[in-house]
């Protein structure tokens, strides 16, 4: 699998992974003890036909062209978890691996 | 996990799974021996904030609102394989489980 990586200076218009630091403090989410911030990344860009298609299904739907089907969109195709320490709302503090918090790769699906 | 199912008569505007039969013969893909056609399904519809969001990450990116980040889009969140019998282009015929050929659930990501 393959995905493009970009930054704020990139001129790339196609589907790409961009850096993004999520700051829980800035959101006012004080129930999260740690981390205060983390590198989440995000996906943005255009999905021209066949470029970075994750699934053969995406190609087949394009071929079949059903009513109302939009073209593929730029979305996470590989994600990873982070460990978090947080209040769970029942006066307990939990340490847990929270899935799908970091975008590792972007693609068209 | 939860996802909406619709059909061609539905008035649902939100992200939904629709039925779609892919016909390999109609595509002229004669290298596929079996199946001749299969139920692939596809995703279509609007992704309003928080509706059917697959990942907490989607919510966080919306909060952070970086440059160029589109809203979440309606895309497969659960897929399954089908078994296919096909010519591999090297005068061999292969039976294989081809991943991500059927959309089982749609969501916003």
């Amino acid at each position: 699998d393959f995905g493009l990586d970009c930054d704020e200076h990139s001129t790339e218009s196609r589907c790409c992974r961009y850096p993004l630091t999520v700051d829980f403090e800035a959101f006012g989410w004080d129930w999260i003890i740690a981390p205060k911030r983390y590198k989440a990344n995000y996906c943005s860009g255009e999905c021209e036909f066949v470029f970075l298609q994750k699934y053969p299904h995406t190609h087949l739907v394009h071929q079949a062209n059903p009513r109302g089907s939009a073209g593929p969109c730029c979305t996470p195709t590989k994600m990873s978890p982070i460990n978090m320490l947080y209040f769970n709302g029942k006066e307990q503090i939990i340490y847990g691996k929270i899935p799908a918090m970091v975008v590792d790769r972007c693609g068209c699906s | 996990d939860f996802g909406l199912d619709c059909d061609e008569h539905s008035t649902e505007s939100r992200c939904c799974r629709y039925p779609l039969t892919v016909d390999f013969e109609a595509f002229g893909w004669d290298w596929i021996i079996a199946p001749k056609r299969y139920k692939a399904n596809y995703c279509s519809g609007e992704c309003e904030f928080v509706f059917l969001q697959k990942y907490p990450h989607t919510h966080l990116v919306h909060q952070a609102n970086p440059r160029g980040s589109a809203g979440p889009c309606c895309t497969p969140t659960k897929m399954s394989p089908i078994n296919m019998l096909y010519f591999n282009g090297k005068e061999q015929i292969i039976y294989g489980k081809i991943p991500a050929m059927v959309v089982d659930r749609c969501g916003c990501s």
């Epitope: - | 004669d30 021996i33 079996a34 010519f87 005068e91 061999q92 015929i93 292969i94 039976y95």
Partner: antibody, heavy 116, light 107 residues
């Protein structure tokens, strides 16, 4: 009703050639891959060749590769097997079969005897 | 090439008996295994495809199971018309190969 009728078998000398035909009816011939399978007298089954629905792709075992050629004429609903450089071990009943995940319909076969 | 080994090579059974035929592949073939029935002087007939799917028009007393390397054809209650030779065939990769056959005879 699916029907497959083989013809063209007979007695041929070693080194000779023969062309088998299989006339198909009862289904959309151009939509399906087709296969040939043979059975030597008193023996088991042996796959000989398969051709894709449009005729673009073919496959053979090593035992016949380079000597046998499978082809089809979708306008005539007919499958062919051109057999060259025939050997005694090619003696068998040759069956054509409609191909899906498996060979789901078979003809009654035509006997090819290779002998001097 | 993938070798297919059938057992037993022959068996004697009575009408109403439950009959089991096994087929073993020399390597894993997923569920790409088909079963055929052949009567003397006749063409083979497909019974089971993809290891366990019953071919249209085949009586439900025939069933198939297995995946990987070990497969089974079961006739739940043998009928007079079931006395024949049965072949397994792998369609996992070419060259497609058949088992040596199992002849089911009347006891």
């Amino acid at each position: 009703e699916v029907q497959l009728l083989e013809s063209g078998g007979g007695l041929v000398q070693p080194g000779g050639s023969l062309r088998l035909s299989c006339a198909a009816s009862g289904f959309t011939f151009s939509s399906y891959a087709m296969s040939w399978v043979r059975q030597a007298p008193g023996k088991g089954l042996e796959w000989v060749s398969t051709i894709s629905s449009g005729g673009s792709y073919t496959s053979y075992p090593d035992s016949v590769k380079g000597r046998f050629t499978i082809s089809r004429d979708n306008s005539k609903n007919t499958l062919y097997l051109q057999m060259n450089s025939l050997r005694a071990e090619d003696t068998a009943v040759y069956y054509c079969a409609k191909q899906d995940y498996a060979m789901n319909y078979w003809g009654q076969g035509t006997l090819v005897t290779v002998s001097s | 090439d993938i070798q297919m080994t059938q057992s037993p090579s022959s068996l004697s059974a009575s009408v109403g008996d439950r009959v089991t035929i096994t087929c073993r592949a020399s390597q894993s073939i997923s569920t790409a295994l088909n079963w055929y029935q052949q009567k003397p002087g006749k063409a083979p007939k497909l019974l089971i495809y993809s290891a366990s799917s019953l071919q249209s028009g085949v009586p439900s007393r025939f069933s198939g199971s297995g995946s990987g390397t070990d497969f089974t054809l079961t006739i739940s209650s043998l009928q007079p018309e079931d006395f024949a030779t049965y072949y397994c065939q792998q369609s996992y990769s070419t060259p497609w190969t058949f088992g040596g056959g199992t002849k089911v005879e009347i006891k």
